[in-house]
């Protein structure tokens, strides 16, 4: 058995921030689970992790430098990404692992969400820009 995941096909991050909702065919209430968001066609970059535990507050973290937060619904996890760069426009995949109680369950690979970062460029602009190059 595999959990099915639904994601929006595309989201636009206008102000370098976006909410990506991962909807699961599984109720996460009272389960211990690890939901994560991965960047790239090969899902090589783990952008953000939400760890849910029946007895503790939700743990949200990124080991790859992304500014992220997470919110839990009964059958969903929403990732809130901030301070995105234009060059982080890419496809992002939701992943879920339900660890406890057994049996272990994970998801069928979803279709992913293309996040198009259109916001302000977050690189610092010089105070006195030099002559533009052709």
């Amino acid at each position: 058995n595999k959990i099915l995941v639904k994601q929006s096909p595309m989201l636009v991050a206008y102000d370098n921030a976006v909410n990506l909702s991962c909807k699961y065919s599984y109720n996460l209430f009272s389960r211990e689970f690890r939901a994560s968001l991965h960047k790239g066609l090969d899902s090589a970059v783990e952008v953000c992790v939400v760890y849910g535990n029946y007895s503790q507050q939700l743990q949200v973290y990124s080991k790859t430098g992304f500014n992220c937060d997470g919110k839990l619904g009964n059958e969903s996890v929403t990732f809130y990404l901030q301070n995105l760069y234009v060059n982080q426009t890419d496809i992002y995949f939701c992943k879920i692992e339900v660890m406890y109680p057994p049996p272990y369950l994970d998801n069928e690979k979803s279709n992913g969400t293309i996040i198009h970062v259109k916001g302000k460029h977050l690189c610092p602009s010089p105070l006195f820009p030099g002559p533009s190059k052709p």
Partner: antibody, heavy 118, light 111 residues
Framework: EVQLVESGGGLVQPGGSLRLSCAAS?????????WGWIRQAPGKGLEWIGE???????YYSPSLKSRVTISRDNSKNTLYLQLNSLRAEDTAVYYC???????????WGQGTLVTVSS | DIQLTQSPSSLSASVGDRVTITCRAS??????????LHWYQQKPGKAPKLLIY???TLQSGVPSRFSGSGSGTDFTLTISSLQPEDFATYYC?????????FGQGTKVEIK
Amino acid sequence: EVQLVESGGGLVQPGGSLRLSCAASGYSISSGYHWGWIRQAPGKGLEWIGEIYHSGSTYYSPSLKSRVTISRDNSKNTLYLQLNSLRAEDTAVYYCARKDYYYALDYWGQGTLVTVSS
Amino acid sequence: DIQLTQSPSSLSASVGDRVTITCRASQSVDFYGKSFLHWYQQKPGKAPKLLIYAASTLQSGVPSRFSGSGSGTDFTLTISSLQPEDFATYYCQQSYRTPLTFGQGTKVEIK
């Protein structure tokens, strides 16, 4: 038949680190089961240390979380346990085991003894 | 954490005796009709061996004199007719919640 063989035990100084290996045969550790480490202090009961899932995700006992790392090398079909800042109470036989569908531990290694002493 | 309390901690019995060991969990370990409670046998200097999983299912290769029962918080391991090779320490273990926890063990000795 699944076989698990631990190695790397021995005498370690307090404050030191240990890295134990668990070589698996008869089953590929990346193929779908989960794998755990358990320890048993001399004359005492069993204590769960942590586990690694076939996805590579790990989970550690809260009491050891800050000192322990479980990893694997799929090419060598081997699991590893790293434990840092060792103290006398870490003296134990360390076992690796496979978790079945219900997370019962259906295959165990023979264990390796770690003694923490100066 | 879920605490598992075994009783008795030790017992003396003779070959042929019926032996019962109980394991009480500090909270239910049931989920959708399954009990995530397992039993192991350990002999001195050896690794534990799985006897019963999911409260009552006999692990492959384990003699039928071993049986398990119970649900919720109260579980029992029964050896219907004790054999010489059954003198060992028995542990229960829950896998309903992390951290996985074990009972303190019950040592079965020869009377």
